[in-house]
């Protein structure tokens, strides 16, 4: 029953975090700027993995989408690449564990196949959180080192003065949202992992006995019966009687009408 | 980099019309403002006029009702139509534009400048 309790719990925090990777990537607040200091109009910037936005104080607000894939910053291409590496792992992990939920029955799937279907998408769920974490880690970091180097440098050039603005940027809410998400994912990939120990089924301390009639006329030797449990004094599966008892290993390979396993 | 690219200027008589223009090239996500200032010789830079990317526009006082801002949002371009120009108007014209240059930061660009000579 803890088993299952734990197995489920991690699947839906799993389904949660992945629900907020993905909100995290579509969203645009990935970094915020408030340009307060002009003359025409207060202007709130904010910027995401695929477009750039301009809200005034009037209220209107535009985006531009970054169409361009050679002009964008190559930190920005490897958080899109992890972020996109982080759903698609989590969208497989969630298909792969909703076959390996023990309350849920599929034809005769053993719990060796479930567990192993558990570990799986638990290991794919540590894999999906970590990505999202590492790809918003980069994102913040790349925030963090665009400040430091825009501090008010000035410099001419062709098309006359430029003049970079010290802002004060901060950390947008899908940074938030994706490190939580991230948390979240790795949380439910590790309740999977630890649910899968208790799937696993025990190991059984006997070795199984098959037993074939090589012919017609076979002479049982006393004790056979006792032996042929499988239990008792004969450990070793060691052959009582010439009627063939065989370990499985040593099951001849050719079919015979008198078989009988 | 971003460049501006600014035309228009000239000579012209008291009471006369010019129209200047502005362009943004370079690598760039939006342009939140665009405007123009003004210096006469042994002046400070004033602004003349500014319009956002919403439409938004504001004028300096000594040129309301004459001059008029307006921008093509696809060209990344400024116009500035100066009607009834006096000769106090004679300055150099400085094209202002607000990029946002990359993630996490933006600039502050100023073109090189147009004169406008207003005489008989």
């Known amino acids: 029953m803890a088993v299952t309790a734990c197995q489920g719990l991690g699947f839906v925090v799993s389904l949660i975090g992945i629900a907020g990777i993905i909100a995290a990537t579509c969203m645009d607040q990935w970094s915020t700027q408030d340009l307060y200091n002009n003359p025409v109009t207060a202007v709130f910037n904010y910027q995401g993995l695929w477009r750039s936005c301009v809200r005034e104080s009037s209220g209107f607000t535009e985006c531009r989408g970054y169409f361009t894939l050679l002009g964008l910053p190559a930190m920005l291409q490897a958080v899109r690449a992890l972020m996109i590496v982080g759903i698609v792992l989590g969208a497989i992990g969630l298909l792969v564990s909703i076959f390996a939920l023990k309350c849920i029955r599929i034809g005769s799937m053993e719990d060796s196949a479930k567990a192993n279907m558990t570990l799986t998408s638990g290991i794919m769920f540590i894999v999906s959180g970590l990505c999202a974490i590492a790809g918003v880690s980069v994102f913040a970091n790349m925030l963090v080192t665009n400040f430091w180097m825009s501090t008010a440098n000035m410099y001419t050039g062709m098309g006359g003065m430029v003049q970079t603005v010290q802002t004060r940027y901060t950390f947008g809410a899908a940074l938030f949202v994706g490190w939580v998400a991230g948390g979240l994912t790795l949380i439910g990939g590790v309740m999977m992992c630890i649910a899968c120990r208790g799937l696993a089924p025990e190991e059984t301390n006997y070795k199984a006995v098959s037993y074939h009639a090589s012919g017609h006329s076979v002479a049982y030797k006393p004790g056979g019966f006792k032996a042929s449990t499988g239990f008792g004094s004969n450990t070793k599966n060691k052959k009582i009687y010439d009627g063939g008892a065989r370990t499985e290993d040593e099951v001849q390979s050719y079919p015979s009408k008198h078989d009988y396993v | 980099q971003v460049q501006l690219q600014e035309s228009g200027g000239g000579l012209v008589q008291p009471g006369g019309s010019l129209r200047l223009s502005c362009a943004a090239s370079?690598?760039?996500?939006?342009?939140?403002?665009m405007g123009w200032y003004r210096q006469a010789p042994g002046k400070q830079r004033e602004l003349v006029a500014g319009?956002?990317?919403?439409?938004?526009?504001n004028y300096g006082d000594s040129v309301k009702g004459r001059f008029t801002i307006s921008r093509d949002n696809a060209k990344n371009t400024v116009y500035l139509q100066m009607n009834s120009l006096k000769p106090e108007d004679t300055a150099v014209y400085y094209c202002?534009?607000?990029?946002?240059?990359?993630?996490?930061?933006?600039?502050?660009?100023w073109g090189q400048g147009t004169l406008v000579t207003v005489s008989e």
């Open positions: 319009i956002s990317t919403g439409g938004t526009t």
């Open positions: 202002n534009v607000l990029v946002i240059s990359g993630i996490g930061s933006h600039l502050e660009v």
């Open positions: 370079g690598t760039f996500f939006n342009i939140p403002v």
